[in-house]
Interface confidence: medium
């Protein structure tokens, strides 16, 4: 039989988690005891393997999707905030599909 994992709905205010501690806080919402969280003590990768990932920006961990992103400084853009823009935060989509 297939094991159906309990659903843990992402907290509505966690679209972009800005946790900086090693242990991201996780609200137990929806799933019984949060059973689908296999790795309960997963470290924030921004403090580990992605520590130097963002060139001109700050690493952010989107906890409920286990995804890392970069919050760029004002004049920079790109996946790693490595490209400089002439216009402040103009949305340049040409490099979106990596």
């Amino acid at each position: 039989s297939v094991r159906v994992e309990q659903v843990v709905k992402p907290p509505q205010n966690k679209t972009e988690s800005e946790n900086t501690s090693d242990k991201p806080k996780r609200k137990k919402k929806g799933g019984k005891n949060g059973k689908n969280r296999r790795n309960r003590k997963k470290k924030n990768p921004c403090n580990a393997e992605f520590q130097n990932f963002c060139i001109h920006g700050e690493c952010k961990y989107i906890e409920h999707l286990e995804a890392v992103t970069c919050k760029c400084q004002q004049e920079y853009f790109g996946e790693r905030c490595g490209e400089k823009s002439m216009k402040t935060h103009s949305m340049i989509d040409s490099s979106l599909s990596k």
Partner: antibody, heavy 124, light 112 residues
Framework: EVQLVESGGGLVKPGGSLRLSCAAS????????MSWVRQAPGKGLEWVST????????YYPDSVKGRFTISRDNAKNSLYLQMNSLRAEDTAVYYC?????????????????WGQGTTVTVSS | DIVMTQSPLSLPVTLGQPASISCRSS???????????LHWYQQRPGQSPKLLIY???NRFSGVPDRFSGSGSGTDFTLKISRVEAEDVGVYYC?????????FGGGTKVEIK
């Protein structure tokens, strides 16, 4: 070039099971959450499930909760949807879609690339 | 669940003329992080959906600038400044501010 190719669809009887697969290429699969979306014949789009990059978190609407299970194998660049206790209303084209990308520090949750879909028909 | 209501259901347009599609949500789509996760997709006949606009007004890669999105809160609009033959298809709005993610019923754009 981002490519998503679904497979595993077919004709199944009510109460039966089916496992859909999605082979991804052209991007770093393990860095992106992934989703399944379906479209019943002549109808609109319905979100079916989303899985986080490492597979730790899975999300479903009530219509499939307890019957469908999303999973992924990052080593194989593959996404799966195990569908059990299938009903006639599950008949649809099932699309695999990438959630992303992560850009400008704003994760915008849009499904930016979609596969061509695989057809699931539930009928006796 | 958030209900997304699109109008009109069908939109016959003349080539070169503008077109406008409305999308209303049953609740505000403003997330607590300040973003509004409202997106628009295009589905041409016989094809899979494609992302057009994300977060209300941002054109996705390769999308022509004749497409634009606007709106806030619960009311949103997709505009095509000059409709071309390749724009024929069904357009869907979608929200991902709240789980479950939901789509509008679609608006079919066809040439008069």
């Amino acid at each position: 070039e981002v490519q998503l190719v679904e497979s595993g669809g077919g004709l199944v009887k009510p109460g039966g099971s089916l496992r859909l697969s999605c082979a991804a290429s052209g991007f770093t699969f393990s860095s992106y959450p992934m989703s399944w979306v379906r479209q019943a014949p002549g109808k609109g789009l319905e979100w079916v499930s989303t899985i986080s990059t490492g597979g730790t978190y899975t999300y479903y609407p009530d219509s499939v909760k307890g019957r469908f299970t999303i999973s992924r194998d990052n080593a194989k660049n593959s996404l799966y949807l195990q569908m059990n206790s299938l009903r006639a209303e599950d008949t649809a084209v099932y699309y695999c879609a990438r959630q992303g990308p992560i850009y400008y520090g704003n994760y915008y949750y849009a499904m930016d690339y979609w596969g061509q879909g695989t057809t699931v028909t539930v009928s006796s | 669940d958030i209900v997304m209501t699109q109008s009109p259901l069908s939109l016959p347009v003349t080539l070169g003329q503008p077109a406008s599609i409305s999308c209303r949500s049953s609740q505000s789509l403003v997330h607590s992080d300040g973003n509004t996760y409202l997106h628009w997709y295009q589905q041409r006949p016989g094809q899979s959906p494609k992302l057009l606009i994300y977060k209300v007004s941002n054109r996705f890669s390769g999308v022509p600038d004749r497409f634009s999105g606007s709106g806030s809160g619960t009311d949103f609009t997709l505009k095509i400044s000059r409709v071309e033959a390749e724009d024929v298809g069904v357009y869907y709005c979608s929200q991902s501010t709240h789980v479950p993610y939901t789509f509008g019923g679609g608006t079919k754009v066809e040439i008069k």
